[in-house]
């Protein structure tokens, strides 16, 4: 498979936001790239979000997506929002070179995202 690199561990902010870079080694000059974030919990794999972009253009996720991102060359900067403690898990970056042919696929080893719910503020007298 195509080589895909991503950090091993990321800690989400107190506001439930986690960011990481997904970098891939392209064999050629792809013009259309699809990036998918998958969450693996136990043996279950679910799709978190996905975006297709043209090289040189911005990465656009659906309006209701919890992900946002920017692209630069063979790097994609991904941000996942609205995370809670129960969302702690392994987040895998999947990269597909869609056009021109041939099709190339790469799967990262995953980024373990730790999410800690903030303590509620104590009541003030």
């Amino acid at each position: 498979a195509m080589h895909v690199a991503q950090p091993a561990v990321v800690l989400a902010s107190s506001r439930g936001i986690a960011s990481f870079v997904c970098e891939y080694a392209s064999p050629g000059k792809a013009t259309e790239v699809r990036v998918t974030v998958l969450r693996q919990a136990d043996s279950q794999v679910t799709e978190v979000c996905a975006a297709t972009y043209m090289m040189g253009n911005e990465l656009t996720f659906l309006d209701d997506s919890i992900c946002t991102g920017t692209s630069s060359g063979n790097q994609v900067n991904l941000t996942i929002q609205g995370l809670r403690a129960m969302d702690t898990g392994l987040y895998i970056c999947k990269v597909e070179l869609m056009y021109p042919p041939p099709y190339y696929l790469g799967i990262g080893n995953g980024t373990q995202i730790y999410v800690i719910d903030p303590e509620p503020c104590p009541d003030s007298d």
Partner: antibody, heavy 115, light 107 residues
Framework: EVQLVESGGGLVQPGGSIRLSCAAS????????MNWVRQAPGKGLEWLAQ??????????YYSDSVKGRFTISRDDSKNSVYLQMNSLKTEDTGVYYC??????WGQGTLVTVSS | DIQMTQSPSSLSASVGDRVTITCRTS??????LNWYQRKQGKSPKLLIY???NLASGMSSRFSGSGSGTDYTLKISSLHPDDVATYYC?????????FGSGTKLEIK
């Protein structure tokens, strides 16, 4: 127009050697990983070998059935990929296809291993 | 190594029928699955790539679906021209194993 043209097939005795060539045109050869796939008579498709390109340090991969006997190589200056086949067995008989990462395929060349 | 279990091995259907071929993998291949069409005496042709994407020049009667370990190739309305053997293939990692093939015939 994309073209992959295999050559070098023929009749060879068990234990013998043969070298297949595949000439590519119509696409950027050096951007692609190249593969050899075969089809034995009455059997299905079998992936044999892959050679990646310069960004991947020309890494090679082989199926267990040919590892140690077959060698894949490429020459980007000639837009060509090769399969050196040694210690041939009768079960290596079949049509051999070269393919650019499975998107583009050649017409195939027949290798017959028989005494 | 990733094992590919393709079924059925052969199939006879009538013109206009909806046809389904399945491929099961021994482990999650994350959608890294291609389908090929091989007509008698011809080279294989890429039909579907990445589990769901129709290859250029192939009829929209063909569609691919699936994820994880279970994948499906569907022909919405069988044409006489669809007589061929169909193969699935793992393209996630080496060895890039093919399924055993499904020979499709017209009744």
């Amino acid at each position: 127009e994309v073209q992959l043209v295999e050559s070098g097939g023929g009749l060879v005795q068990p234990g013998g050697s043969i070298r297949l060539s595949c000439a590519a045109s119509g696409f950027t050869f050096s951007d692609n990983w190249m593969n050899w796939v075969r089809q034995a008579p009455g059997k299905g498709l079998e992936w044999l070998a892959q050679i990646r390109n310069k960004p991947y340090n020309y890494e090679t991969y082989y199926s267990d059935s040919v590892k140690g006997r077959f060698t894949i190589s490429r020459d980007d200056s000639k837009n060509s990929v090769y399969l050196q086949m040694n210690s041939l067995k009768t079960e290596d008989t079949g049509v051999y296809y070269c393919t650019a990462q499975f998107a583009y395929w050649g017409q195939g060349t027949l290798v017959t291993v028989s005494s | 190594d990733i094992q590919m279990t393709q079924s059925p091995s052969s199939l006879s259907a009538s013109v206009g029928d909806r046809v389904t071929i399945t491929c099961r993998t021994s482990e999650n291949i994350y959608g890294g699955l291609n389908w090929y069409q091989r007509k008698q005496g011809k080279s294989p042709k890429l039909l579907i790539y990445g589990a769901t994407n129709l290859a250029s020049g192939m009829s929209s009667r063909f569609s691919g679906s699936g994820s994880g370990t279970d994948y499906t190739l569907k022909i919405s309305s069988l044409h006489p021209d669809d007589v061929a053997t169909y193969y699935c293939q793992n393209v996630l990692r080496s060895p890039f194993t093919f399924g055993s093939g499904t020979k499709l015939e017209i009744k």
